[in-house]
């Protein structure tokens, strides 16, 4: 007989989610208003298009990328949408409270929605490590804690290090990856006998995951350039991201074949490695002066991604309980670090070129920023993991991991799949 949604969660989730939504509506009512300044139509459309690109990345790209499980594809896509919708609302309020609140009201602009979508993207990257092992009520908690932690991290970095929006947001890769991995580490790990097949990928869900990867691949230049301050910076960022992701696709497919004894291409490797270049150049996408450098970074990132996908899943499955196909967490943790290291290397080269020890201070500041991002990610991730382990959330039993039927109504199925 098909498994019903647990009664306790049926009581808890709607009440918890709708109460939270009501609270958000009240906060929006009392503390926000729309930007009253008259925008020109052309500028409005251009600004909206960037936001739209980011929403497509989040809803379709990351939504489908995480949908490769044989029996958890519906939940992956829909839960991602749920988290995105909730995350954007909370991120708009939080960003407003942290940056504008002394003025008494939070002014909502298209840019605030853009920032909020990027903040919510962080949750969608992290959640890949825990999808299938948590219910919606737990995901609500994860959204609230992660968006709050990222918002505060960005504010602290902005105030202490005086970094711009772009540099501030580019810690998202490292932050999201380490947050997700630390949450996964706290959750029950062993998959009971008889459920191993559920965390395997299937052809149609894998195809939809590839679709997600394609959407992310197409729009990654928009993500990396969205927060830069001038047209020339944005243009360079778009070019460099495009070259990097183009090369990482070629590297991913050929590297995947190279890594297999029979020369076969792994779908899982390709899903994540195609994005490798975009993550690796993220921090310094506007600083790279020529295509060949961006392409070299794309190549290195692709190789690291394929290498990671080959050797890390065993360790991640054992230590963190992350299934083989959920490779986004450790992939982004490696590539995010690579991106940050590339930026620090550029600063080091400046130091060497100038022969000025004081520039070394900037290197230390950048290392400080990165360390702060990792520490806050790990601490808030562990806190979230501990919260998710509370009995109040009625987490799915280990035997029900990676099972759509726990959460969805399938009228055509009288019995299990």
């Amino acid at each position: 007989m098909s498994s019903k949604y647990p009664r306790s969660v049926r009581r808890c989730l709607p009440l918890w989610a709708l109460t939270l939504e009501a609270a958000l509506i009240l906060l929006f009512y009392f503390f926000t208003h729309y930007d009253a300044s008259l925008e020109d139509q052309k500028g409005l459309v251009a600004s909206y298009q960037v936001g739209q690109d980011l929403t497509v990345m989040a809803a379709i790209g990351l939504g489908f990328l995480t949908s490769s499980f044989r029996r958890h594809s519906w939940s992956s896509v829909a839960f991602n949408l749920f988290m995105l919708a909730l995350g954007v609302q909370w991120a708009i309020l939080l960003d407003g409270f942290l940056s504008q609140f002394p003025s008494g009201k939070v002014v909502i602009t298209l840019f605030s929605i853009r920032l909020a979508t990027m903040s919510a993207l962080s949750v969608l990257i992290s959640v890949d490590a825990v999808l299938g092992k948590v219910n919606l009520a737990q995901l609500v908690v994860m959204v609230l804690v992660e968006v709050t932690a990222l918002g505060n991290l960005r504010m602290v970095i902005s105030n202490i290090f005086n970094t711009d929006y772009h540099m501030n947001m580019m810690h998202i890769y490292v932050f999201a990856a380490y947050f997700g991995l630390s949450v996964a580490w706290c959750l029950p790990k062993p998959l009971p006998e008889g459920t191993e097949d559920k965390d395997q990928t299937a052809t149609i869900p894998s195809l939809s995951a590839m679709l997600g990867a394609l959407f992310l691949w197409m729009f990654w230049p928009s993500f990396n350039s969205a927060l830069l301050r001038s047209p020339i910076e944005r243009k360079n960022a778009v070019f460099n991201t495009y070259y990097a992701v183009a090369v990482s696709v070629v590297t991913a497919i050929s590297g995947s074949s190279l890594a297999h004894p029979q020369g076969k291409i792994s779908k899982t490797y390709v899903h994540s490695a195609v994005l490798a270049g975009g993550v690796a150049v993220g921090t310094s996408c506007h600083l790279i002066p020529s295509p060949w450098l961006a392409m070299v970074l794309g190549l290195v990132a692709g190789l690291i991604s394929v290498g990671g996908a080959k050797y890390l899943p065993g360790c991640c499955n054992r230590v963190l309980g992350i299934p083989h196909s959920s490779i986004m967490g450790y992939n982004f943790s490696l590539l995010g670090l690579l991106g940050e290291i590339i930026y620090i290397v550029l600063l080091v080269l400046d130091t060497v070129g100038a022969g000025n020890g004081m520039i070394g201070f900037q290197v230390l500041l950048s290392i400080g920023e990165l360390s702060l991002a990792i520490v806050i990610a790990l601490m808030s991730g562990l806190l979230t993991g501990l919260l998710l382990n509370l009995k109040i959330w009625k987490a799915p039993h280990e035997a029900k991991y990676f099972d759509d039927q726990v959460f969805w109504k399938f009228p055509h199925l009288a019995v299990g799949f």
Epitope: E39, D40, K42, G43, A46, S47, T109, L110, F111, R114, S158, N162, T163, D164, Y165, L227, L228, R229, S230, P231, I232, E233, N236, S284, H286, L287, I288, P289, S290, L293, L346, L349, D350, G353, A354, N356, M358, I359, F361, Q362
Partner: antibody, heavy 129, light 107 residues
């Protein structure tokens, strides 16, 4: 020729609000970041706020954060500064300035340099009870 | 915030003199430094950006040097119209700051 003309200054009581405007002409306004800079009587220059070419990025000096709001209307070639909760120390001549961008490359990285190459004549704001 | 300290605060010189004004940053700002000139009752004017690049239309007697924390503006042969207040400005961080100014007066 390239020109910036500020308006909206005047005498205002502490705690009240004022809105400054800056009309731009002679250049493609929508392609450039813009700044507000002020100068208190007998004092030096103080940077106040910046807005990027498309209005997305905004930065404020700590002394005005949460009280002042910079905005722009690219269809009308105007820059604005909404000043709320004014204090006596906000008394100054307020200048709007166009951002000048320049970039050069070494073999391994780009460098973006910015300055303010065109300034308005300034508008005086006096906060006094 | 990055503080800029100019020295001297004021100086007296004659037409034809060579004058150097220095600007020191509280932390390294690479070459992200501009110099402005302001005459009484007038708006400032950009002279030099990126520490040493002369803005178009600015006479070649003005030159800038330095990187990291120590910078200098040099006027090789002072002219009557150069008697003004000079400001340095950093654009390294998102919060731009100016030096307190150096007033160049006629002896």
């Amino acid at each position: 020729q390239v020109q910036l003309v500020e308006s909206g200054g005047g005498v205002v009581q502490p705690g009240r609000s004022l809105r400054l405007s800056c009309a731009a002409s002679g250049f493609t306004f929508s392609s450039y970041g813009m700044h507000w800079v002020r100068q208190a009587p007998g004092k030096g220059l103080e940077w106040v706020a910046f807005i990027s070419y498309d209005g997305s990025n905004k930065y404020y000096a700590d002394s005005v954060k949460g009280r002042f709001t910079i905005s722009r209307d690219n269809s009308k070639n105007t820059l604005s500064l909404q000043m709320n909760s004014l204090r006596a120390e906000d008394t100054a001549v307020y200048y709007c300035a166009k951002e000048h961008g320049y970039y050069r490359s070494s073999w391994y990285r780009n460098y973006y340099y910015y300055g303010m190459d065109v300034w308005g004549q300034g508008t005086t704001v006096t906060v006094s009870s | 915030d990055i503080q800029l300290t100019q020295s001297p605060s004021s100086l007296s010189a004659s037409v034809g003199d060579r004058v150097t004004i220095t600007c020191r940053a509280s932390q390294s700002i690479s070459s992200y430094l501009n110099w402005y000139k302001q005459r009484p009752g007038k708006a400032p004017k950009l002279l030099i950006y990126a520490a040493s690049t002369l803005q178009s239309g600015v006479p070649s007697r003005f030159s800038g040097s330095g990187s990291g924390t120590d910078f200098a503006l040099t006027i090789s042969s002072l002219q009557a119209e150069d008697f003004a207040t000079y400001y340095c400005q950093q654009t390294y961080s998102t919060l731009w700051t100016f030096g307190q100014g150096t007033k160049v007066e006629i002896t």
